[in-house]
Amino acid sequence: LQDPCSNCPAGTFCDNNRNQICSPCPPNSFSSAGGQRTCDICRQCKGVFRTRKECSSTSNAECDCTPGFHCLGAGCSMCEQDCKQGQELTKKGCKDCCFGTFNDQKRGICRPWTNCSLDGKSVLVNGTKERDVVCGPSPADLSPGASSVTPPAPAREPGHSPQ
């Protein structure tokens, strides 16, 4: 015998209290597939979360983060504070990248500058705390019309190159 509940479409649930007829999901709940015996409670985007997509009878609400924060985890399960470029988030808040490291994003950690010599290349542009080193072409790559590799100017202060 076919389960009568299998006829209940998304946005409804199979109501055991009413002879298994299909009842619409109550307010603030949803069912994203057919044949459900209950509707799920809609996610509420509160506090540092804000609503990106409202809940409907067939799909859950989606949250993102308020300005100054960014999403982490599947489905934006957490919001983490933004930092400025050239910084990383620590337990004590946003801290500047140490000399020799950079972060070009508002999230994540400071990473060491690229070591150009690992690829047999030289430094074309110095790194800063906001930007990675740029590696120049290896001598074999140079051809007419390509930039010649000029030695980098010494940095005027830790983590910064002259602009």
């Epitope: 400025k84 070009d104 060491p112 500058w113 906001e130 990675d132 740029v134 590696c135």
Partner: antibody, heavy 127, light 111 residues
């Protein structure tokens, strides 16, 4: 020689979906950031999304966030763009672009620009 | 409305020099590398300048890039008819967590 070949474009109704593919050859696909960039007829270039090869991190333009998903299959040397809830303003030529700066040696590709481009695939959104 | 501002058009006569500007802010051009692209009519863009001022192999030294503060410039000297194209600046914008393009400058070579 770097070659990028986009496919999957076509006519779709507003609210519909399309999946674009970009077949890459001539370079070590798994070592480079890859982007999708679009251009509506007679309009500017607009960056859509980027995916990193090392950590799989993805970033999107605000105009497509929550509707488009970029992905890659390094074993097939292929880049994808899944486009859902399409709107009239999504109609454009979609280019697949390879970034310079091979990873993991290079930590950030942003300095090197997009040094390889496909010829594009046209997406039309109309009822 | 693009985050990076370029003049919509520029022109020059063969042999002359033309400069195209690109203006942004501290979250993009000010702290990040600028790249320039050339798009000939009906074709895909081509990388012209990377890391503010460096040319990829094969790009003639008639093309040069520079940057000061939150603005960048592309200069083309010894203009040729084949330089007639759209030119786009681009960079990473950390506050948007994404790449941004200018809206392009259409270069016309007169005469």
């Amino acid at each position: 020689e770097v070659q990028l070949l986009e496919s999957g474009g076509g006519l779709v109704q507003p609210g519909g979906s399309l999946r674009l593919s970009c077949a890459a050859s001539g370079f070590t696909f798994s070592g480079y950031d890859m982007s999708w960039v679009r251009q509506a007829p007679g309009k500017c270039l607009e960056w859509v999304s980027v995916i990193y090869p090392d950590d799989g991190n993805t970033y999107y333009a605000d105009s497509v966030k929550g509707r488009f998903t970029i992905s890659r299959d390094n074993s097939k040397n292929t880049l994808y763009l899944q486009m859902n809830s399409l709107r009239a303003e999504d109609a454009a030529v979609y280019y697949c672009a390879k970034h310079g700066g091979q990873k993991p040696t290079t930590k950030s590709s942003s300095a090197y620009g997009m040094d390889g481009w496909g010829q594009g695939t046209l997406v039309t959104v109309s009822s | 409305q693009s985050v990076l501002t370029q003049p919509p058009s520029a022109s020059g006569t063969p042999g002359r020099r033309v400069t195209i500007s690109c203006s942004g802010s501290s979250s993009n051009i000010g702290n990040n590398y600028v790249t320039w692209y050339q798009q000939l009519p009906g074709t895909a863009p081509k990388l012209l300048i990377y890391a503010d001022s460096h040319r990829p192999s094969g790009v003639p030294d008639r093309f040069s890039g520079s940057k000061s503060g939150t603005s960048a410039s592309l200069a083309i000297s010894g203009l040729r008819s084949e330089d007639e194209a759209d030119y786009y600046c681009a960079t990473w914008d950390y506050s948007l967590s994404g790449y941004v393009f200018g809206c392009g400058t259409k270069l016309t070579v007169l005469g």
